[in-house]
C-alpha cells in the first residue's frame, strides 16, 4: 500500500537498518526509497526537547510485515518509502537549506557569488554530493562567499548542525542538470586499476554499470565476466573511484569489461531498471518466498509486486509437474544484489522491475527549442501526437500527449460522434501532416476512456485517455511528457507553450507544420472575470495574452499546454475551450492536469 504522507510526532519502533543524516523528513523519505531494503523511516527534526546530536537523524527501517509499531515522540517524523508506490520517483533535490551545515569531507573550497553558483559547481564536479556555502553575512570575514564542496561514502552528510548565515544543498546531478561528460561506452578486455570502494555481484557489465551509477561514490567500474579465469572473482563488479575522477591505469585483460558511472547520462539512460532475464543463471540471496509460477516473466511480476523482493530465480517445471508451473524464488540481500551468481543449474534469474519507476523516461532532455517563430522543429515536442479519424475520410481530429508507453492523454470533447476506437489512428513523431501517408505506421486505439463526469468542455472534466493497441518505443522523436506532481500545485509556471496543428484563425484549416506559441498562464480569478457566463473551476487552468493574438484554436484540442519547470517539461494543461481564438481578454481554457493525476493513475494502472 502506498502511503505518501508523513506522520508527525510519530516514531517507528525497531526494524533499524542504518542511520543517516538528512536535512528534512522529505529527503529522508527519498533516501529510504533509494535504499535497497528500507521500507519505513523515522526522522528527528530540530527541537528544543531533543538532544541536538539527534537532530536531522534519519533512521532507515525494514519490516517483514511492511509496518512497525508507532510510538508518540515529539519532533519525530515518520513515513514510508515510495517503493510501495507506483508513481515515478526522483532523487532530484533542489532545496536549499538555510542555516544548516551539512558535514562531509570538504575536498574543495572556492569563492562563489551565490549559493546557486556553488550548487552549480557541485553539480559539475564529479566527486561532489552536497555543498555548504557561507553567505556574505557570515561572521568570519575570510570564510564569506566560500563554497565548500563535500562528499561522503553514503552520499548523505555524516552530520548536520545548525550554523547561522550558511546554506547547504545537494548536487543536482540526479536532476539531469550536470554538464559533466556522459561516457556510455563499455570497454572490453579492460581493467581499471584504481581503488575499489565497494564490490557487488552482477550478471553482466550493464547491470554493473547501472549499480555504479546509483552508488554515491562510484565513478567507474570493472566487471569480471563469467569466463574470467579466477573462479572466485567471476561476476564480480568492482566499484571504483580516483582523485582525478578518471581511471589512472587501464590494464588489458581478457574477459574483463570496464566503464564509467552514467550519473551524467541519467536523464537518457535507465540506471535502476535491470529488465533482462539471465538464462541458466541462479542468483543467491536471502529467500523471501517460494511461489509457483508459469514462466520466468510471471516470476518477475511476482517479484516486482512483492515490495521486499529485489531479485529472483525461476526454475522451470519438470515435465507434467505441478500443472506445468515452475518454482519462483523471491530473494533479497543487504545491498540489492545477489550474494553469489551461479551458472549451469538451469535457473532463469532477473531483478524486480519496481525500481524502473526511478528512471523517468519523461525527464529526458530534448532538443533545445528554436526561439521565436511559430513553426516547430522535429523532435521539439516529442510527446505531441496527432489523432486522426478515418471517418468520413482520414484527417487530423485532435492533438494528444504521450504520457506512457501505451497511453495518450487528450480531451474528452474530441470524441463526440466517435462510435468506436477502431476508427482512430494515433501518429507520433510527426512534424508535418503531409508526412502521413497511407503506409505511415500508426498506433491503433484499443480503448477510449472518457472521464465519467464529462458533459461538455465548458463544464470541465474535459479529459480522456486513449489506450493504444501496441506500445510506443521511446525515441528522440516520440517520448512521454511528465505529469505534474500533486506537490507542485503551487508552482508558478513561467515557460508554457501550446502546440498543435489547429487553425491559425477562426475560419481557417488544419496547419501542415506543428505550430507552437509561448503563452503566459492567467490566474483563475482573472480568467473568471473574462468568462462571466461560465464557471472557471480549479480543475481548469487558463492561458493567454490580455491583448490576444496567440492562442490555441480549432484542431489544437486535446493537445498539450507544456510547461518547463526545473528543466523538465510537464503536461500542465489539455487544450479544451475558449471564446473564439486569440481574442482580446479571452484566454484559452485548459483542463488542469494536476487535478486529474489520481484519475489518470487509477485508469492507467487498472490493468
Amino acid at each position: 500500500e502506498c502511503v505518501t504522507q508523513l506522520l508527525k510526532d510519530t516514531c517507528f519502533e525497531g526494524g533499524d537498518i542504518t542511520t543517516v543524516f538528512t536535512p528534512s523528513a522529505k529527503y529522508c523519505q527519498v533516501v529510504c526509497t533509494y535504499h535497497p531494503r528500507c521500507l519505513l523511516f523515522t526522522f528527528t527534526a530540530e527541537s528544543p526537547s531533543e538532544d541536538p546530536t539527534r537532530w536531522f537523524t534519519c533512521v532507515l527501517k525494514d519490516s517483514v510485515t511492511e509496518t512497525l509499531p508507532r510510538v508518540n515522540r515529539t519532533a519525530a517524523i515518520s513515513g514510508y518509502s515510495f517503493k510501495q508506490c507506483s508513481h515515478q520517483i526522483s532523487a532530484c533535490n533542489k532545496d536549499i537549506y538555510v542555516d544548516l551545515d551539512m558535514k562531509g569531507i570538504n575536498y574543495n573550497s572556492s569563492v562563489a557569488k551565490s549559493a546557486q553558483e556553488c550548487q552549480e559547481r557541485c553539480t559539475d564536479d564529479v566527486h561532489c554530493h552536497f555543498f555548504t556555502y557561507a553567505t556574505r553575512q557570515f561572521p568570519s570575514l575570510e570564510h564569506r562567499n566560500i563554497c565548500l564542496l563535500k562528499h561522503t561514502q553514503t552520499g548523505t552528510p555524516t552530520r548536520i548542525t545548525k550554523l547561522d548565515k550558511v546554506v547547504s544543498g545537494f548536487s543536482l546531478k540526479s536532476c539531469a542538470l550536470s554538464n559533466l561528460a556522459c561516457i556510455r561506452d563499455i570497454f572490453p578486455n579492460t581493467v581499471f586499476a584504481d581503488s575499489n570502494i565497494d564490490s557487488v555481484m552482477a550478471p553482466d557489465a550493464f547491470v554493473c554499470g547501472r549499480i555504479c551509477t546509483h552508488h554515491p561514490g562510484c565513478l567507474f567500474f570493472t566487471f569480471f565476466s563469467q569466463e574470467w579465469p579466477k573462479e572466485s572473482q567471476r561476476n564480480l563488479c568492482l566499484l571504483k573511484t580516483s582523485e582525478s575522477g578518471l581511471p589512472s591505469t587501464r590494464i588489458k585483460k581478457s574477459k574483463a569489461l570496464s566503464g564509467f558511472s552514467l550519473q551524467s547520462c541519467r536523464h537518457s539512460i535507465p540506471v535502476f531498471c535491470h529488465s533482462s532475464f539471465y538464462h541458466d543463471t541462479d542468483f543467491l540471496g536471502e529467500e523471501l518466498d517460494i511461489v509457483a509460477a508459469k514462466s520466468h516473466e510471471a516470476c518477475q511480476k511476482l517479484c516486482t509486486n512483492a515490495v521486499r523482493c529485489q531479485f529472483f530465480t525461476y526454475t522451470p517445471a519438470q515435465a507434467s509437474c505441478n500443472e506445468g508451473k515452475g518454482k519462483c524464488y523471491l530473494k533479497l540481500s543487504s545491498n540489492g544484489s545477489p550474494t553469489k551468481i551461479l551458472h549451469g543449474r538451469g535457473g532463469i534469474s532477473g531483478y524486480t522491475l519496481r525500481l524502473c519507476k526511478m528512471d523517468n523516461e519523461c525527464t529526458t532532455k530534448i532538443k533545445p527549442r528554436i526561439v521565436g517563430g511559430t513553426a516547430s522543429v522535429r523532435g521539439e515536442w516529442p510527446w505531441q501526437v496527432t489523432l486522426h479519424t478515418t471517418s468520413p475520410t482520414q484527417r487530423h481530429l485532435c492533438g494528444g500527449s504521450i504520457i506512457g508507453n501505451q497511453w495518450i492523454l487528450t480531451a474528452a470533447h474530441c470524441f463526440y460522434g466517435v462510435e468506436s476506437p477502431k476508427i482512430l489512428r494515433v501518429y507520433s513523431g510527426i512534424l508535418n501532416q503531409s508526412e502521413i501517408k497511407e503506409d505511415t505506421s500508426f498506433f491503433g486505439v484499443q480503448e477510449i476512456i472518457i472521464h465519467d463526469q464529462y458533459k461538455m468542455a465548458e463544464s470541465g472534466y474535459d479529459i480522456a485517455l486513449l489506450k493504444l493497441e501496441t506500445t510506443v518505443n521511446y525515441t528522440d522523436s516520440q517520448r512521454p511528457i511528465c505529469l505534474p506532481s500533486k506537490g507542485d500545485r503551487n508552482v508558478i509556471y513561467t515557460d508554457c507553450w501550446v502546440t498543435g496543428w489547429g487553425y491559425r484563425k477562426l475560419r481557417d484549416k488544419i496547419q501542415n507544420t506543428l505550430q507552437k506559441a509561448k503563452i503566459p498562464l492567467v490566474t483563475n480569478e482573472e480568467c473568471q472575470k473574462r468568462y462571466r457566463g461560465h464557471k472557471i473551476t480549479h480543475k481548469m487552468i487558463c492561458a493567454g495574452y490580455r491583448e490576444g493574438g496567440k492562442d490555441a484554436c480549432k484542431g489544437d484540442s486535446g493537445g498539450p499546454l507544456s510547461c518547463k519547470h526545473n528543466e523538465v517539461w510537464h503536461l500542465v494543461g489539455i487544450t479544451s475551450w475558449g471564446e473564439g481564438c486569440a481574442q482580446r481578454e479571452r484566454p484559452g481554457v485548459y483542463t488542469n492536469v494536476v487535478e486529474y493525476v489520481d484519475w489518470i493513475l487509477e485508469k492507467t494502472q487498472a490493468v
Epitope: 471517418s391 468520413p392 475520410t393 476508427i423 497511407e438
Partner: antibody
Framework: QVQLVQSGSELKKPGASVKLSCKAS????????MHWVKQAHGQGLEWIGN????????NYDEKFRTRATLTADTSTSTAYMHLSSLTSEDSAVYYC??????????WGQGTSVTVSS | DIVMTQSPSSLSASVGDRVTITCKAS??????VSWFQQKPGQAPKLLIY???NRYTGVPDRFSGSGSGTDFTLTISSLQAEDVADYHC?????????FGQGTKLEIK
C-alpha cells in the same frame, strides 16, 4: 493489387429485397471504410452509407436509413448491402467503393439492379 | 446536408482546349473535395483528392484547385480520351454528397 469484385445483376419485383456483395482483396479489409454509392441511369452519384469492417460502425444517408443495411464478413473480406422494400426508384447501378487514405480510391465494377413487375 | 452544385451540366470542347468544371459547396468543406472521371459503362475513377492533389497515375493535364466552398477541375489540354462524365464529391461531413455531374464531349 486492390480489387473490389461485386455480385452479378439482379432483377427483382417491387416489395422484394436484394442483397449485394462486394469481395475485397489486395489490402487489409478491416482497416478501411467501405462505402456504397447508387447511380440511377443517366444520373449523378448518390451516397447510401458506409461500414468499418473492424468495428461494424456504420453511417447512412437519412433517405436509405430504414431500408439499407450494411454488413461485413471479415473472414471472407466481403461487404454486403441489403436493400428492402424495393420500388422502381431503386433501379440503378450500385457501387461499392473503398475510402482510401485520401478519397474513394477503388471502386467495384458495379451491380445493376432492376426492379420491375 | 451539404449540397454540391456542379456546373456546367454538359460541355463540348475541342481537342487541345483548356476545360474548366466548377463545383460549389453550400457550406465550407475546407479541402475535402474529390473529382472523379466516369467513362460510359465503367465505374468512376479517382482523379483529384483533397481539392488539388492528383491521384497516382492521373495525367498532369488534370489539376484541381479551391478551398472552402469553391472548387475547380481543369483539363489544360483536352484529349479525345477525356470524353466522360465528371463528378465532384465532398467527404467533409456526413452524409457524403456529390455534384450532379458534368458530361464532357468533343466538338
Amino acid at each position: 493489387q486492390v480489387q473490389l469484385v461485386q455480385s452479378g445483376s439482379e432483377l427483382k419485383k417491387p416489395g422484394a429485397s436484394v442483397k449485394l456483395s462486394c469481395k475485397a482483396s489486395g489490402y487489409t479489409f478491416t482497416r478501411y471504410w467501405m462505402h456504397w454509392v447508387k447511380q440511377a441511369h443517366g444520373q449523378g452519384l448518390e451516397w447510401i452509407g458506409n461500414i468499418y469492417p473492424d468495428s461494424d460502425s456504420t453511417n447512412y444517408d437519412e433517405k436509405f436509413r430504414t431500408r439499407a443495411t450494411l454488413t461485413a464478413d471479415t473472414s471472407t473480406s466481403t461487404a454486403y448491402m441489403h436493400l428492402s422494400s424495393l420500388t422502381s426508384e431503386d433501379s440503378a447501378v450500385y457501387y461499392c467503393t473503398r475510402m482510401g487514405f485520401y478519397a474513394m480510391d477503388y471502386w467495384g465494377q458495379g451491380t445493376s439492379v432492376t426492379v420491375s413487375s | 446536408d451539404i449540397v454540391m452544385t456542379q456546373s456546367p451540366s454538359s460541355l463540348s470542347a475541342s481537342v487541345g482546349d483548356r476545360v474548366t468544371i466548377t463545383c460549389k459547396a453550400s457550406e465550407n468543406v475546407v479541402t475535402y473535395v474529390s473529382w472523379f472521371q466516369q467513362k460510359p459503362g465503367q465505374a468512376p475513377k479517382l482523379l483529384i483528392y483533397g481539392a488539388s492533389n492528383r491521384y497516382t497515375g492521373v495525367p498532369d493535364r488534370f489539376s484541381g484547385s479551391g478551398s472552402g466552398t469553391d472548387f475547380t477541375l481543369t483539363i489544360s489540354s483536352l484529349q479525345a480520351e477525356d470524353v466522360a462524365d465528371y463528378h465532384c464529391g465532398q467527404s467533409y461531413s456526413y452524409p457524403l454528397t456529390f455534384g450532379q455531374g458534368t458530361k464532357l464531349e468533343i466538338k
